[in-house]
Amino acid sequence: TPEVWVQVRMEATELSSFTIRCGFLGSGSISLVTVSWGGPNGAGGTTLAVLHPERGIRQWAPARQARWETQSSISLILEGSGASSPCANTTFCCKFASFPEGSWEACGSLPPSSDPGLSAPPTPAPILRADL
């Protein structure tokens, strides 16, 4: 069964800066990745970035840099000031559309006890939705 993992990290140098990393553990080819915050995409969440493996990347504030890390994982740097700034309990979600598995989405947030610059190793987050 495919899985999605999400890792959220606060940068030590800038406390309003977050790095979100997401990955897809499956054998299919990824056709699209959507990163949102405040909840799952399409369920109250706000899209931060959309990444297509070949067409390109679209991102919106406070996203600063979205990129592919590997063929099955992405990272997104957020920096905010004021209303658009993420906070420690913000939920970030990643939705991977793949063929033939369908869409798989998972969410994560900063571990409650984590120090700036530290985070738990990326582990598969609970799968919220699988749209086949």
């Epitope: 679209r58 504030a61 992405i74």
Partner: antibody
Framework: EVQLVQSGAEVKKPGSSVKVSCKAS????????IEWVRQAPGQGLEWIGE????????NYNEKFKGRVTFTADESTSTAYMELSSLRSEDTAVYYC???????WGQGTLVTVSS | DIVMTQSPDSLAVSLGERATINCKSS????????????LAWYQQKPGQPPKLLIY???TRESGVPDRFSGSGSGTDFTLTISSLQAEDVAVYYC?????????FGQGTKLEIK
């Protein structure tokens, strides 16, 4: 298949504003950004910016910041581009596009002339 | 901003012959993470909007004839029409799809010799 239908040609005076609409059908309007591109007569293509209809998040080309505003109405699947303080150099065909420029509107000619 | 420079500005090719258009970017369009080049090619005929031909430097958009092909990596890219047809007369643009703002080449006008 996504279809984008734009509003008709406009003739405007220098200093005024123009609002161009782009109505989408055949796809999920809120999922992908609507891009705006212009093309002056006999010239190349210039990206103005984009809006993500679902959240009204925007990105603007620095060249147009402060003069252009993007809005979107999810209820009618329509995106709008308003360009203010028009000058003769803004005479161009304005296009909306979606899904990484795979789909395009037919274009709207905006003529700025006194 | 990434500057896209096409060559030649105009090109005349006989029907059935090969047409080649080059595009050079001022920065690499290669995403090292997934080894994909974020470059697109468009065809524009008079009075029409641009039509996407190629994305990811070499992937043909659905419905595009296989006589169109794209190649290249990093900063140097090529659009090739293997056997020119009359309906291929148009202006062709390359585009940076790697980073904001998306920027286009100045265009190459393709005519029949």
């Amino acid at each position: 298949e996504v279809q984008l239908v734009q509003s008709g040609a406009e003739v405007k005076k220098p200093g005024s504003s123009v609002k161009v609409s782009c109505k989408a059908s055949g796809g999920t309007f809120s999922s992908f950004s609507i891009e705006w591109v212009r093309q002056a007569p006999g010239q190349g293509l210039e990206w103005i910016g984009e809006i993500l209809p679902g959240s009204n998040s925007t990105n603007y080309n620095e060249k147009f910041k402060g003069r252009v505003t993007f809005t979107a109405d999810e209820s009618t699947s329509t995106a709008y581009m308003e360009l203010s303080s028009l000058r003769s150099e803004d005479t161009a065909v304005y296009y909306c596009s979606s899904y990484w420029f795979a789909y395009w509107g037919q274009g709207t000619l905006v003529t700025v002339s006194s | 901003d990434i500057v896209m420079t096409q060559s030649p500005d105009s090109l005349a090719v006989s029907l059935g012959e090969r047409a080649t258009i080059n595009c050079k970017s001022s920065q690499s369009l290669l995403n090292s993470g997934n080894q994909k080049n974020y470059l697109a090619w468009y065809q524009q005929k008079p009075g029409q909007p641009p039509k996407l031909l190629i994305y990811g430097a070499s992937t043909r958009e659905s419905g595009v004839p296989d006589r169109f092909s794209g190649s290249g990596s990093g900063t140097d890219f090529t659009l090739t029409i293997s056997s020119l047809q009359a309906e291929d007369v148009a202006v062709y643009y390359c585009q940076n799809a790697h980073s904001y703002p998306p920027t286009f080449g100045q265009g190459t006008k393709l005519e029949i010799k």
